[in-house]
């Protein structure tokens, strides 16, 4: 009677044992989905917008830019929603005719204010940046620059934003805003280690890219040399970001961007023609263009091969020779002549080249096009195709890109020629070391560019030092608080399955 | 701030040259014209020429063409203006000044006299 | 060439007073809808010191008594409460095409 007893007892205890387990086990796995979901559950995201407007000399795009306000120290959390391109030339081209920049910049401004929410539009900063065009026109005259950006400002003024104002910015500026841009969306300014990567090019170290950019007028090159000390003052810039300093080597060639080299090279081999016909190998056989001796002397760019012509025009007739046509660009470079210990061309400080290196702006463009940008092409097949490219005839470029403007496609031969006479020949990057160069036109969807760089540095959006933070954010805690809650709860059942064998387990109950 | 600081005064025997030395700081070199200005004794100021840094191409008044040389030391951030046969009338102070169109910013002068 | 004829030569104005002087160019001196026209003020021994720019812009540190007024081949710079460091020699210039010419100088003294 007494043995029936206790094992009652001790069926009943441990059925009720293993019952308040298994509700308690329920409930707390409950709970902790409960308490990962709510903790996580999209909550409404207070999000902030930036406008930059980058006045090139070519053309002038739009971007506009989103956070969330909550993280705005954190790296990486600021992406580009929107680019808009101004339809037209640069701003620097409408100095004889001002009054027309108010409806020039009509349509990107509107796209704006439709991308932007209302109630956002009055503390959305709109910031103007003009570069290397505009550098040139006041270099010409400061009076006719300052007349554009006063338009440009009063025009900008009008929309319902916050607008920061038009301004120049300087060669050093846009070297390392462009060098900010690519690094920050590359992440190098992390501190935390990633266990994965989404982000192209992205290596596991912390090494920051190197920047080349190039435009219509200027290229820039900025990057972290191995030795901190430098011989060129003007071209050292010192930056703490994260926690970190950096001392970087930037420089910006003016007049060395595609479109003003290519005037460089015209006035350059028109002083030696014997008539008023060039015959040009950067451009495609049975190609012709006539240009205005005016329009060739107008940019300061050509001031040193400028010379009285007994013609008021000549013509370009395109002979298609890669090979000349990379002679007679390497003329623009003066490389005999350096007083430190290592020179880019025309007696510009140059350390030696370090680490990996994002192209963007046009060397991206002109290499995309001619369908050279992939990590696998090496410098001599990319010499190989810029031959075959450049010895093709007009007629044929025409039908085979049937819908791109002859302006832009007859410079392609010339373009891609200079890109490799600069990088090759100006910034002494070798075959071997030509695989550390990335061409990049966007990153993580944000183009590369000295855009966001600015941006976030007039939005104090970059702090000199690391923000403090908990190790892991908190839904990467709730939701491994959550995974671990289960695992845990898997292996105790697990385990009182594989310790209690069934017989023994239920022995008790029989 | 913006600089320009110009070498010191020269006496010159007639038929000699002159080079006048001016050091900008405080500015991208490259970006902006350097012109000199000359001022003789109680005369008005007389333009003379300018340099684009950039790339040392100049651009003279007739009057000093094929006397006159403006050359660059980028490295150096100096311009330089040379003026060779000088006669008693080049007597004056030599200014370069950094601009465009707009001389806003200018040297201290170097007195050139030219004296037998 | 484009010539800059100042008027007049000298001028003496009681302190506090208005002075004006005038410049007149062989040519108009606007272009793209912008005056060539610069004011400079030069004290004995001194680089001369830009004034006014674009015809009617004051430069940087410039006080307000300084204006300037005008386009095309007249203008003219005012100052409206002369002061005793304002005495100097004022020049006229003109940058729309070289070679850049100066005017003749006024001279502006205390009476």
């Known amino acids: 009677m007494e043995d029936t007893k206790e094992s009652n007892v001790k069926t009943f205890c441990s059925k009720n044992i293993l019952a308040i387990l298994g509700f308690s086990s329920i409930i707390a796995v409950i709970a902790l989905l409960a308490v990962g979901l709510t903790q996580n559950k999209a909550l409404p995201e207070n999000i902030k917008y930036g406008i930059v407007l980058d006045a090139g000399s070519s053309h002038t795009s739009l971007y506009i830019y989103k956070w969330p306000a909550e993280k705005e120290n954190d790296t990486g959390v600021v992406h580009q929603v929107e680019e808009c391109r101004v339809k037209g030339p640069g701003i620097s081209k409408y100095v004889q005719k001002v009054n027309e920049i108010g409806i020039y910049l009509t349509d990107c401004m509107e796209r704006a204010r439709e991308v932007i929410p209302r109630s956002q539009h009055q503390e959305t900063p709109v910031y103007l940046g003009a570069t290397a065009g505009m550098r040139l026109l006041r270099m010409e005259s400061e009076e006719l620059a300052d007349r554009v950006l006063d338009v440009v400002e009063r025009s900008l003024s009008n929309y319902p934003f916050d607008f920061q104002g038009a301004r120049i910015i300087t060669g050093q500026e846009e070297g390392a805003y462009g060098w900010i841009t690519i690094n920050y969306l590359l992440g190098k300014f992390s501190q935390k280690t990633r266990w994965f990567s989404i982000v192209p090019y992205e290596t596991n170290n912390q090494e920051t890219f190197g920047a080349l950019d190039l435009g219509g007028a200027s290229t820039q090159i900025t990057f972290v040399p191995q030795n901190q000390t430098t011989e060129s003052p003007d071209n050292a810039l010192q930056f703490r970001l994260y926690g970190k300093d950096y001392n970087v080597y930037t420089h910006s060639f003016l007049c060395y961007g595609k479109d003003q080299a290519l005037w460089q090279k015209l006035a350059k081999d028109i002083q030696v023609a014997s008539n008023e016909i060039l015959r040009d190998p950067c451009f495609h056989p049975g190609y012709k263009k006539v240009v205005n001796v005016s329009d060739l002397y107008k940019t300061p760019c050509t001031k040193r091969f400028e010379m009285t012509l007994p013609f008021q025009q000549f013509e370009i007739q395109g002979i298609g020779n890669y090979q000349q046509c990379h002679q007679s660009v390497l003329e623009l470079f003066n490389t005999s002549y350096c007083p430190y210990s290592q020179c880019a061309f025309n007696g510009i400080f140059l350390p030696p080249l370090q680490g990996d290196f994002g192209a963007f702006s046009a060397f991206y463009f002109v290499m995309n096009f001619l369908n050279l940008t992939s990590e696998k092409v090496s410098q001599e097949k990319v010499t190989e195709m810029m031959k075959k490219f450049c010895s093709q005839p007009w007629e044929e470029i025409k039908t085979s890109y049937a819908g791109v403007k002859e302006k832009y496609l007859s410079e392609y031969c010339f373009s891609g020629t200079y890109i490799l006479s600069l990088l090759l020949q100006g910034y002494h990057f070798t075959a071997d070391s030509w695989e550390h160069i990335h061409f990049i036109g966007k990153i993580q969807g944000s183009d590369a560019g000295w855009t966001l760089g600015y941006m976030l540095n007039l939005t104090n959006m970059i702090p000199a030092e690391q923000p403090l933070s908990t190790p892991l954010s908190h839904s990467t805690y709730v939701f491994l608080m959550v995974l671990f809650s289960l695992v845990l709860v898997i292996v105790a059942i697990i385990g009182l399955l594989i310790f209690h064998k069934p017989s023994y387990f239920w022995k008790d109950m029989v | 701030q913006v600089q320009l600081v110009q070498s010191g005064a020269e006496v010159k025997k007639p038929g000699a040259s002159v080079k006048v030395s001016c050091k900008a700081s405080?500015?991208?070199?490259?970006?902006?014209?350097m012109h000199w200005v000359r001022q003789a004794p109680g005369q008005r100021l007389e333009w003379i020429g300018y340099?684009?840094?950039?790339?040392?191409?100049?651009t003279f008044n007739q009057k000093f063409k094929g006397r006159a040389t403006i050359t660059v030391d980028t490295s150096a951030r100096t311009a330089y203006m040379e003026l060779s046969s000088l006669r008693s009338e080049d007597t004056a102070v030599y200014y370069c000044?950094?601009?465009?169109?707009?001389?806003?910013?200018w040297g201290q002068g170097t007195l050139v006299t030219v004296s037998s | 060439d484009i010539v800059m004829t100042q008027s007049p030569d000298s001028l003496a104005v009681s302190l506090g007073e208005r002075a004006t002087i005038n410049c007149k160019a062989s040519?108009?001196?606007?272009?793209?809808?912008?005056?060539?026209m610069y004011w400079f003020q030069q004290k004995p021994g001194q680089p001369p010191k830009l004034l006014i720019y674009?015809?009617?812009n004051q430069g940087s540190g410039v006080p307000d008594r300084f204006s300037g007024s005008g386009s095309g081949t007249d203008f003219t710079l005012t100052i409206s409460s002369l002061q005793a460091e304002d005495v100097a020699v004022y020049y006229c210039q003109q940058t729309k095409e070289v070679p850049y010419t100066f005017g003749g100088g006024t001279k502006v003294e205390i009476k």
């Open positions: 040519e108009s001196v606007d272009n793209f809808g912008v005056s060539f």
């Open positions: 000044a950094r601009g465009g169109t707009r001389f806003a910013y």
């Open positions: 674009g015809a009617s």
């Open positions: 405080g500015y991208t070199f490259t970006d902006y014209n």
């Open positions: 340099i684009v840094p950039l790339n040392g191409g100049s």
